[in-house]
């Protein structure tokens, strides 16, 4: 191709490639990405004493090894296996909380209900939450200018593959009754194309998971509809039931009151419905 001809004529070495960086459609690697990951790991292992055996430098090396010097549209789950191994953590049965399109409320909930865990409460999820990263083929550079967009560029990019990998693992290791928080304000309350719908649902293990309980979070104060009857929830029920996992659904009409009652369950107003 013409680009290769230019490289040949100029005798450009691969490690000099950053001058001709590929322009991706997505935003570039988060500023100070290596420092952020390392600092988050140190903080996590401090506040979670049971994870003190984790060597944060090794975690960063494994994280870096998953995407550095690799073409950022050709990342595989295999690339992240060394990192997954280092970050192995178990959640007690009945304590897994999945979520879809309602991350903030799910995290507010587990900050109060300390014995339940979202993926972002686990080491690997905590490290990567809200961050973007990618490298470049045959260079040790991190690309801070742009990274592949899932829709416009490719799905096998470092960030998407990471979340697919750790989400799969999180679902695979869940046991007992698994809970999922769903956003009742969206047109598709259950979206088959979300991480929950495309990865987690299909990786719950029927021999370990007795039931999936969906909490549908209502948006409007006056919204008294039974969103558990929504067609997409019925679709979720069908998928789960076919996998020999029982399905339950609850409407959370007042998310503000719901959180308040998690904080203060003895409050008299919490004895009525939320």
């Amino acid at each position: 191709s013409g680009l290769n001809d230019i490289f040949e004529a100029q005798k450009i070495e691969w490690h000099e490639l950053p001058r001709w960086r590929q322009q991706w459609s997505g935003s570039g690697t988060t500023s100070r990405f290596p420092e952020t990951v390392l600092a988050r790991c140190v903080k996590y292992t401090e506040v979670h004493p049971e994870m003190r055996h984790v060597d944060c430098q090794s975690v960063w090396d494994a994280f870096k090894g998953a995407f550095i010097s690799k073409y950022p549209c050709n990342i595989t789950e295999e690339d992240y296996q060394p990192l997954v191994k280092l970050g192995t953590q178990t959640v007690p049965c009945n304590k897994t909380l999945l979520w879809s399109r309602i991350k903030d409320l799910a995290h507010q909930f587990t900050q109060v209900q300390r014995d339940m865990f979202t993926l972002e409460d686990m080491l690997l999820g905590y490290l990567a939450d809200d961050l973007t990263w990618c490298g470049e083929f045959n260079t040790f550079e991190i690309n801070y200018q742009s990274c592949p967009d899932w829709r416009k560029d490719c799905s096998n990019n470092p960030v998407s593959v990471f979340w697919k990998t750790v989400s799969r693992r999180f679902a695979e290791t869940a046991c007992g009754v698994v809970h999922v928080m769903l956003n009742g304000s969206r047109s598709k309350i259950f979206d088959k194309n979300s991480t929950f719908g495309s990865v987690e649902v299909h990786n719950l293990q029927p021999e370990k998971v007795q039931a999936l309980e969906a909490w549908v979070i209502h948006g409007g104060r006056e919204d008294s509809r039974d969103l558990c009857q929504d067609p997409t929830i019925k679709e979720l029920e069908s998928i789960i039931s076919k996998r020999n996992i029982r399905f339950f659904c609850k409407n959370i009409y007042r998310p503000d009151k719901f959180l308040q009652c998690v904080k203060n369950p003895e409050d008299s107003s919490c004895l009525s419905g939320i």
């Epitope: 140190v42 903080k43 401090e46 506040v47 004493p49 007690p92 209900q113 300390r114 014995d115």
Partner: antibody
Framework: QSLEESGGGLVKPGASLTLTCKAS?????????MCWVRQAPGKGLEWISC???????TYYANWAKGRFTISRTSSTTVTLQMTSLTAADTATYFC?????????WGPGTLVTVSS | DIVMTQTPSSVEAAVGGTVTIKCQAS??????LAWYQQKPGQPPKVLIY???TLASGVPSRFKGSGSGTHFTLTISDLESADAATYYC???????????????FGGGTEVVVK
């Protein structure tokens, strides 16, 4: 592996005192929580402060903020500086810690505040 | 700071019997709870950590359970050597504002007849 406290004794109200906790058989090179806990005569245990040796971050009970200062002074010693002591501070002061939970305790050092 | 409420403050039981001590946290602490045994003139000794994990060298007669805000220590097949004061201890953190705290329950004196 063991811990030993020193620096206790009889002091007058309003005085200051520094207690030292020395680790034997291990060092604080990797992250662990080193804490001070006290016990007034015939009373229960009361948490004062902890330091995480991995980062140097310090944490205090609300009542202890301002008057107590925890520090790591070497790879094997942690100190607790106490100021404006009153009779209510009379207690056995324990140093405790470990990498996971407070599994290691010193024998304690008695601090008596009396005029 | 979190408040740990321990009950009863004192309990008496016969050798071979069973004692149950309860501890309630003022906030949900997950499973970050430890139980200690203290005998007069000695420092506390850890029995259980992370709510239910038996510390090294501790007999299986000691059992910890619970999660969130309610926890229990059960001592079965009581021996005279179990006469001591038992304390629960919580650990709490928030990652976002760099807050960590520890707290002890008021203690339970176990008298073995």
């Amino acid at each position: 592996q063991s811990l030993e406290e020193s620096g206790g004794g009889l002091v007058k109200p309003g005085a200051s005192l520094t207690l030292t906790c020395k680790a034997s058989g291990f060092s604080f090179s990797s992250g662990c929580d080193m804490c001070w806990v006290r016990q007034a005569p015939g009373k229960g245990l009361e948490w004062i402060s902890c330091i995480y040796t991995g980062s140097g971050s310090t944490y205090y009970a609300n009542w202890a903020k301002g008057r107590f200062t925890i520090s790591r002074t070497s790879s094997t010693t942690v100190t607790l500086q106490m100021t404006s002591l009153t009779a209510a501070d009379t207690a056995t002061y324990f140093c405790a810690g470990d990498s996971d939970y407070l599994g290691l305790w010193g024998p304690g050092t008695l601090v008596t505040v009396s005029s | 700071d979190i408040v740990m409420t321990q009950t009863p403050s004192s309990v008496e039981a016969a050798v071979g019997g069973t004692v149950t001590i309860k501890c309630q946290a003022s906030q949900n602490i997950g499973n970050y709870l430890a139980w200690y045994q203290q005998k007069p003139g000695q420092p506390p000794k850890v029995l259980i950590y992370r709510a239910s994990t038996l510390a090294s060298g501790v007999p299986s007669r000691f059992k910890g359970s619970g999660s969130g805000t309610h926890f229990t220590l059960t001592i079965s097949d009581l021996e005279s050597a179990d006469a001591a004061t038992y304390y629960c201890q919580s650990y709490y953190y928030t990652t976002d504002d760099n807050y960590r705290s520890w707290a002890f329950g008021g203690g339970t004196e176990v008298v073995v007849k």
